[in-house]
Interface confidence: low
């Protein structure tokens, strides 16, 4: 509560996160024209990335475009992209939706459709839906340990959310264990009133708010965090504003001295840890 | 404007960015001693990296050192690095400017120059100027969508910069469309009084400031962002303080069971999104 | 000092860091069953990663698991993980400490021990101690240049920590050169009362605080940074709360058309640059 006689000061904060969990992924894999079920294991090195401070990312879904090489090929026949003659294609034109630069020629994409030829990473990425259910939907059971160190420089006071008395095998629960800083990802979503399984398909951004309301007067000292959760991306967002959360990255390699890449469109949850609060002292 | 009767509170913010655009890069490529013009396409997976929150990076230029391997070789003959005898070279010495550790021998770098031999990734990186004009100078036409979700926890008020009424094909303009959150990179520079083509050579840091001045009283409610732009790196910086913005990263691979790497010195624009403002309520 | 007549405003800040230095690493390398001493050079592209803004990471130690492939293998025989019959192994079970999913079979790990077979990246990571002394302990002599641009939007005032008069070959010292913004990593630790050599083994988080106390009145103008350092991770942390600072990442490659990876558990120092302060004006 506000004590008007107190000198209030905003918190200076540092965050460290550690995600734990493994996922078994089952997907259709095509080799030599034959499609079969493939099983693979994803661990932290596969589904998360070395991130800085106040954010961490967990990949929950993906679409791969394997064996791309820089050359000429027909672009993907998305709505409005088909052509019937070269007149429809403009040499040097970069369509914002396209993945390459047009050569000016209209060429067959498959037996029934023709599209403008482009200079690009080929074959161009297919604009297919994110797999449903999400490939790493079991990430719901992953846990994240959040370590938060705070400082009120004016009061020369430092503390952290993990106390020596804490139990390393706890799991946060709003009622039973509100000071535990190990969170099950599915619980975070449940607390925020969101459905993990649903969000995992397209990705999203989840806020973990850590609020420190600190009374630093020695006679009524109190300084512990309160955790709350809310979704930060707009689930009702129009398609043109890129709903969910995804990014593309590439694994480059050489084959017969030709540079190739596997393009991965990674969907997932970015967790933003938002630390705020004040320290008051007489 | 300041209303003294209001309780003011700083903003808690989360940012999500999405860059769009492709670049055609033309550069001299040497293979088997023959130099020819090479054309390649760069898309988001090639010129940007999965970044967290309030920053994103767009590579606008680069210098590559291909096929480096860990061995012994002469260091690059930069100013003051040449030698005429072993006496000039000190075994175990690491020159801060050098890329390796001296063996103590003075060896030929080319027909006319000798330098100290080093244990390093060889051949050592040539200290050549960044290409001018910048290889990805067409990044000026890339666009970035900025999604910003804000929260005033004390007032229990949340909003975002993208409204349902917004048009997904808009482009920000200070006068014509100041609420559109899709920005052309070239326009950002123009607004900040900077020349994109020039900055793209060495790289730089550009601030996108989002200012929320929110009056949360129901009878005079107003809460919309104002965007402004300013360059954050010092364009007049002395050479010794590393002007522009660049970093080195490596692509590692194996050839005949020998680990090799391609070293890329990437120049580009780091965009920092600086969100600030206050929410006031009676 | 607090001047009650002044309008105070928090600082808006942007940070850019540049690490310099090379390390020689000597470690045991096993090839074809023969173990010999291997020497390698690590430069910035090897030990640091393109990071955003207010954090940078320097790898000081690592453990590698080379040539992993997705298949079935015995899990690592850590405490409590050994088995004597299939009954101890549960098909589909993911032990939080394990790196894979149990198949239900109990199989030999080596001549004397049996563990549950798992579907995982195999052979599974050995749970061995971080090397002591740290492999990149010489990172103590690396330097970091910190560029900090600050802005008080309400006062329309901008400045930076690097002045035109500064000497690019300086090194920060609290007494002799408190305005130099090139810091030796070992000095940062010394100032914070910490032992770099010790922290380098398991990793840690170090805070670099930049405090701007700015009086922007023209007749008594003062606006320069003050640097201070403090360790942000808990050195006395219980094992269950993951002491130090490390993360795993992977280098993926193909061999005979089989995807393989080298898993690196990287220990190191994450430096968080915490900028705070106020600008006051009549």
């Amino acid at each position: 509560s506000d004590k008007l006689y107190q000198r209030k000061e905003p918190v200076i904060s540092s965050v460290h996160t550690k995600v734990k969990g493994i996922a078994e992924v089952t997907e259709n894999v095509t080799e030599g024209g034959v499609t079969k079920l493939g099983h693979s294991i994803f661990d932290t090195a596969d589904y998360t990335f070395p991130l800085q401070g106040n954010s961490f990312f967990v990949m929950t879904n993906y679409v791969k475009s394997e064996g791309q090489v820089q050359t000429l090929c027909p672009e993907y026949p998305r709505r409005g992209a088909q052509c019937s003659s070269d007149r429809r294609c403009k040499k040097g034109w970069m369509d914002p939706q396209s993945k390459g630069i047009q050569t000016g020629r209209c060429v067959p994409y498959d037996k029934t459709r023709k599209t403008c030829e482009v200079s690009a990473w080929c074959p161009t990425e297919e604009e297919k839906e994110a797999p449903r259910p999400a490939l790493l939907r079991s990430a719901e059971n992953f846990t994240v340990l959040i370590k938060n160190n705070i400082h009120f420089p004016g009061h020369n006071y430092t503390t952290r959310n993990i106390l020596p008395t804490m139990n390393g095998s706890c799991t946060f629960h709003k009622a039973w264990d509100p000071q535990c800083s190990i969170f099950r990802l599915g619980d975070i979503f449940q607390e925020a009133g969101e459905n993990f399984t649903e969000v995992a398909v397209q990705g999203g951004i989840m806020g973990i708010e850590i609020y420190w309301d600190c009374n630093l007067d020695s006679w009524s000292h109190h300084c512990r965090p309160r955790y709350s959760f809310r979704r930060l991306d707009d689930k009702n967002m129009d398609e043109s504003f890129v709903p969910g959360y995804n990014f593309r990255y590439a694994k480059y390699y050489k084959e017969n001295n030709v540079e190739k890449r596997t393009l991965i469109k990674a969907f997932g949850i970015r967790f933003d840890i938002l630390v705020f609060g004040t320290g008051g002292k007489f | 404007s300041d209303k003294l009767y209001q309780r003011k509170e700083p903003v808690i913010s989360s940012v999500h960015t999405k860059v769009k655009g492709i670049a055609e890069v033309t550069e001299n490529v040497t293979e088997g001693g023959v130099t020819k013009l090479g054309h390649s396409i760069f898309d988001t997976a090639d010129y940007t990296f999965p970044l967290q929150g309030n920053s994103f990076f767009v590579m606008t230029n680069y210098v590559k050192s291909e096929g480096q391997v860990q061995t012994l070789c002469p260091e690059y003959p930069r100013r003051g690095a040449q030698c005429s005898s072993d006496r000039r070279c000190k075994k175990g010495w690491m020159d801060p400017q050098s890329k390796g550790i001296q063996t103590g021998r003075c060896v030929p770098y080319d027909k006319t120059r000798k330098t100290c031999e080093v244990s390093a990734w060889c051949p050592t990186e040539e200290e050549k100027e960044a290409p001018r004009p910048a290889l990805l100078r067409s990044a000026e036409n890339f666009t970035v969508l900025i999604k910003n979700n804000i929260h005033f926890p004390g007032h229990n008020y949340t909003t975002r910069n993208i409204l349902p009424t917004m048009n997904g094909s808009c482009t920000f303009h200070k006068a014509w469309d100041p609420q559109c959150s899709i920005f052309r990179l070239g326009d950002i520079f123009q607004e900040a009084g900077e020349n994109f083509t020039e900055v793209a050579v060495q790289g730089g840091i550009m601030g996108i400031e989002i200012y929320w001045d929110c009056n949360l009283d129901s009878w005079s409610h107003h809460c919309r962002p104002r965007y402004s732009f300013r360059r954050l790196d010092d364009k007049n910086m002395d050479e010794s303080f590393v002007p522009g913005y660049n970093f080195r990263y490596a692509k590692y691979y194996k050839e005949n069971n020998v680990e090799k790497r391609t070293l890329i010195k990437a120049f580009g624009i780091r965009f920092d999104i600086l969100v600030f403002g206050t929410g006031g309520k009676f | 000092s607090d001047k009650l007549y002044q309008r105070k405003e928090p600082v808006i800040s942007s940070v850019h860091t540049k690490v310099k230095g090379i390390a020689e690493v000597t470690e045991n390398v096993t090839e074809g069953g023969v173990t010999k001493l291997g020497h390698s050079i690590f430069d910035t592209a090897d030990y640091t990663f393109p990071l955003q803004g207010n954090s940078f990471f320097v790898m000081t130690n690592y453990v590698k698991s080379e040539g992993q492939v997705q298949t079935l293998c015995p899990e690592y025989p850590r405490r409590g993980a050994q088995c004597s019959s299939d009954r101890r192994c549960k098909k589909g079970w993911m032990d939080p400490q394990s790196k894979g999913i149990q198949t239900g079979r109990c199989v030999p790990y080596d001549k004397t021990r049996k563990t549950c077979e798992v579907s995982a990246w195999c052979p599974t990571e050995e749970e061995k101690e971080a090397p002591r002394p740290a492999l990149l302990r010489s990172a103590e002599n690396f330097t970091v240049l910190i560029k900090n641009n600050i802005h008080f939007p309400g006062h329309n005032y901008t400045t930076r920590n690097i002045l035109p008069t500064m000497n690019g070959s300086c090194t920060f010292h609290k007494a002799w050169d408190p305005q130099c913004s090139i810091f030796r990593l070992g000095d940062i630790f010394q100032e914070a009362g910490e032992n770099f050599t010790e922290v380098a083994v398991q990793g840690g988080i170090m805070g670099i605080e930049i405090y701007w106390d700015c009086n922007l009145d023209s007749w008594s103008h003062h606006c320069r940074p003050r640097y201070s350092f403090r360790r942000l991770d808990d050195k006395n942390m219980d094992e269950s709360f993951v002491p130090g600072y490390n993360f795993r990442y992977a280098k993926y490659y193909k061999e005979n058309n089989v995807e393989k990876r080298t898993l690196i558990k990287a220990f190191g120092i994450r430096f968080d640059i915490l900028v705070f302060g106020t600008g006051g004006k009549f």
């Epitope: 059971n141 095998s169 706890c170 799991t171 190990i182 | - | 009954r87 101890r88 549960k90 098909k91 589909g92 079970w93 032990d95 939080p96």
Partner: nanobody
Framework: EVQLVESGGGLVQPGESLRLSCTAS????????IGWFRQAPGKEREGVSC????????AYADSVKGRFTISRDIVKHTVYLQMNSLQPEDTAVYYC????????????????????WGEGTLVTVSS
């Protein structure tokens, strides 16, 4: 080794209540399914009540439904079995066990291959 320590057993009259406690040490309670099992003299061990870690759901043997309740106190690192309206046929040694339960929502004989077992605590219901 992981330890599970049961307590709270004893002699009670029919219709009375008991609360059994199972305390775990040095092990991750939140990662394992937890179950209470019992073995009456000359009979097979049977499942009484289980708590599933993945979603916190619980399951009970038909014979104890409505009378027994399983709960967990994360801070104290303890699992409880609250037993009301006890009958003579509830007389048994009660064991606490932890491990992965495969058939979700069930806690029945033959379905458990728990990794960790306590020593047991004797509950005698007799007038």
């Amino acid at each position: 080794e992981v330890q599970l320590v049961e307590s709270g057993g004893g002699l009670v009259q029919p219709g009375e209540s008991l609360r059994l406690s199972c305390t775990a040490s040095r092990f991750m309670l939140d990662y394992y399914d937890i179950g209470w099992f019992r073995q009456a003299p000359g009979k097979e061990r049977e499942g009484v009540s289980c708590r599933f870690t993945n979603d916190g759901s619980t399951a009970y043997a038909d014979s104890v439904k409505g009378r027994f309740t399983i709960s967990r106190d994360i801070v104290k690192h303890t699992v409880y079995l609250q037993m009301n309206s006890l009958q003579p046929e509830d007389t048994a040694v009660y064991y606490c066990a932890a491990g992965p339960l495969t058939k979700r929502r069930q806690c029945v004989p033959g379905d458990f291959s728990m990794d960790f077992w306590g020593e047991g605590t004797l509950v005698t219901v007799s007038s």
